[in-house]
Interface confidence: low
Amino acid sequence: MVPPPENVRMNSVNFKNILQWESPAFAKGNLTFTAQYLSYRIFQDKCMNTTLTECDFSSLSKYGDHTLRVRAEFADEHSDWVNITFCPVDDTIIGPPGMQVEVLADSLHMRFLAPKIENEYETWTMKNVYNSWTYNVQYWKNGTDEKFQITPQYDFEVLRNLEPWTTYCVQVRGFLPDRNKAGEWSEPVCEQTTHDETVPS
């Protein structure tokens, strides 16, 4: 009897949908695996007789529930199928956006770049999929614990009237208000402000 794949899970980030599993202990030899998806009531092969422990399902429709399954195989024997259900638009993890930060005197000018989607047009981003897409920004004075959060209305934001000659750190994430779903924070970007440009009267 061939044991089934273990720890079967979907690792989906920005609609790059990778079904992953682990090979069970099997004394007779090396196992291969077949992974399938349900399409119009018929299971279709996606990865056949692979020695890998993952299979890329990024070409699935972003909408609706998908049933995926994987089994282990050895010679003419095979394990039971292990099934999972997956809805990309609900379940994919929103990866961190890109961010460009520029210091101008006592202000930080930020531009945000929504994560790109795998297997789509070059310009296609998560904003194209989620109508309610917005950004959360948090910033703080370097070395302090107090963080301030803002929700920009656009793909850019300016933090004004900051303390001069002070290092501020900024990070951004995607947020879907209608789903109350937050993405992963970007790595903090820390920049030092320069002088206050206000002229004393």
Partner: nanobody, 123 residues
């Protein structure tokens, strides 16, 4: 549709113990992942522990702040996953949620969520 029902939360003093249970109904594979997330007041939901079944034993994953204090286990025959929480601290106060497909603990994205059970640790 998978449904998850948590229980076992409550009020406990610092240093005490609680055991949370989550019963899964509907289709869940014993070889897929299931585990616990938590959300403290005013904070992000975070992964706590996740487990999958394995012919070589269990494969468990914990966040650093609970490692050595919390133990996750599952009983596939009862479709139940447990979280044994020892040496509880006030920082552990949160609503604890059960979730499937939880392996990426750093991002609280999961297939199915329970309604949650409140854990309060008093000092």
């Amino acid at each position: 549709q998978v449904q998850l029902v948590e229980s076992g939360g409550g009020l406990v003093q610092s240093g005490g113990s609680l055991r949370l249970s989550c019963v899964a109904s509907g289709f869940t594979s014993p070889y897929s992942t299931i585990g616990w997330f938590r959300q403290a007041p005013g904070k992000e939901r975070e992964g706590v522990a996740c487990i999958s079944s394995s012919g070589r034993g269990v494969n468990a994953n914990y966040i650093d702040s609970v490692r050595g204090r919390f133990t996750i286990s599952r009983d596939n025959a009862k479709n139940t996953v447990y979280l044994q929480m020892n040496k509880l601290k006030p920082d552990d106060t949160a609503i604890y949620y059960c979730a499937t497909n939880c392996w990426r603990l750093t991002s609280p994205a999961a297939d199915n969520w329970g309604q949650g059970t409140q854990v309060t640790v008093s000092s």
